[in-house]
């Protein structure tokens, strides 16, 4: 089994690891499928691509019968199988079988924290946000290891790219020193950003 790892939105080339000459194409059937669902077929030189792959998939016959998937999505992850059948003695017989496992990485960038003064009060508001990752994120605010209550946390998913965006607001009393951590967990991974507030100098700075 061949393993291919790519970033989301990139191009993945999955090789069947087999070549068929132009002359042999008329007697050859080629199938690409993902977990038993059809991706594309080529029968006697005529190709057919299944609807969910039509707008993103290309068949490169000259390069080991590879399929090229453009604009990778998280749902493209999985095991692809290439089957080559050749017509011999009144029947199609299997000439080649290959499996390719595709992993699609979609890491959230380090979140950014911006802050706003709320007029006529000692309250300051900070907003932590990041986007472009997968799977669904869970955001939490921490101070001294203790979880804080956010005002509101929104998680949205782009239906086209399948990627998530997350944003959360936190209000704090600006008369005391603070060190807040915005922690985002997704799958087995995590990213974080720290926001420090110093009352003596009335300044703040994120840790990078």
């Amino acid at each position: 089994v061949i393993h291919v790892t790519k970033e989301v939105k990139e191009v993945a080339t999955l090789s069947c690891g087999h070549n068929v000459s132009v002359e042999e194409l008329a007697q050859t059937r080629i199938y690409w499928q993902k977990e038993k669902k059809m991706v594309l077929t080529m029968m006697s030189g005529d190709m057919n691509i299944w609807p969910e792959y039509k707008n993103r998939t290309i068949f490169d016959i000259t390069n080991n019968l590879s399929i090229v998937i453009l604009a990778l999505r998280p749902s493209d992850e999985g095991t692809y199988e290439c089957v080559v059948l050749k017509y011999e003695k009144d029947a199609f017989k299997r000439e080649h079988l290959a499996e390719v496992t595709l992993s699609v990485k979609a890491d959230f960038p380090t979140p950014s924290i911006s802050d706003f003064e709320i007029p006529t009060s000692n309250i300051r508001r900070i907003i932590c946000s990041t986007s472009g990752g997968f799977p669904e994120p869970h955001l939490s605010w921490l101070e001294n290891g203790e979880e804080l209550n956010a005002i509101n946390t929104t998680v949205s998913q782009d239906p086209e790219t399948e990627l998530y965006a997350v944003s959360s607001k936190l209000d704090f009393n600006m008369t005391t020193n603070h060190s807040f951590m915005c922690l985002i967990k997704y799958g087995h991974l995590r990213v974080n950003q720290t926001f420090n507030w110093n009352t003596t100098k009335q300044e703040h700075f994120p840790d990078n």
């Epitope: 132009v22 002359e23 194409l25 080529m42 030189g45 005529d46 190709m47 691509i49 039509k54 707008n55 993103r56 998939t57 290309i58 068949f59 490169d60 016959i61 000259t62 390069n63 590879s66 090229v68 453009l70």
Partner: nanobody
């Protein structure tokens, strides 16, 4: 740079035939396939058919299967689109394009200027 020049368009009655040509010049060796697309007034550009440089493999959009045939002449560096049983809904500007990846509906890089096909009822 690749240059593509389409020809063969015109006015034809429903049920009639036309043969479009696309002459390619320049760095065509960097492409693995060529395709035909069409764009009707006020609509998006739609895939019609594609063929590998060797001519051994073809790919058609469902709405033209059985009516249109794509072929190529390597000696002339030209790709053809034979259009039979034409319908008024086939009226569009037809473009040819090159694909550096292979056979498919996407990934095309160089485009011709287009040739108008009008099918009257």
């Amino acid at each position: 740079e690749v240059q593509l020049v389409e020809s063969g368009g015109g006015l034809v009655q429903a049920g009639g035939s036309l043969r479009l040509s696309c002459a390619a010049s320049g760095r065509t060796f960097s492409s693995k396939a060529m395709g035909w697309f069409r764009q009707a007034p006020g609509k998006e550009r739609d895939f019609v058919a594609a063929i590998t440089w060797s001519g051994g493999s073809t790919y058609y959009a469902d709405h033209v299967k059985g009516r249109f045939t794509i072929s190529r002449d390597n000696a002339k560096n030209t790709v053809y689109l034979q259009m039979n049983s034409l319908k008024p809904e086939d009226t569009a500007v037809y473009y040819c394009a090159t694909n550096p990846y292979g056979l498919g509906q996407v990934g095309y890089d160089y485009w011709g200027q287009g040739t108008q096909v009008t099918v009257s009822s």
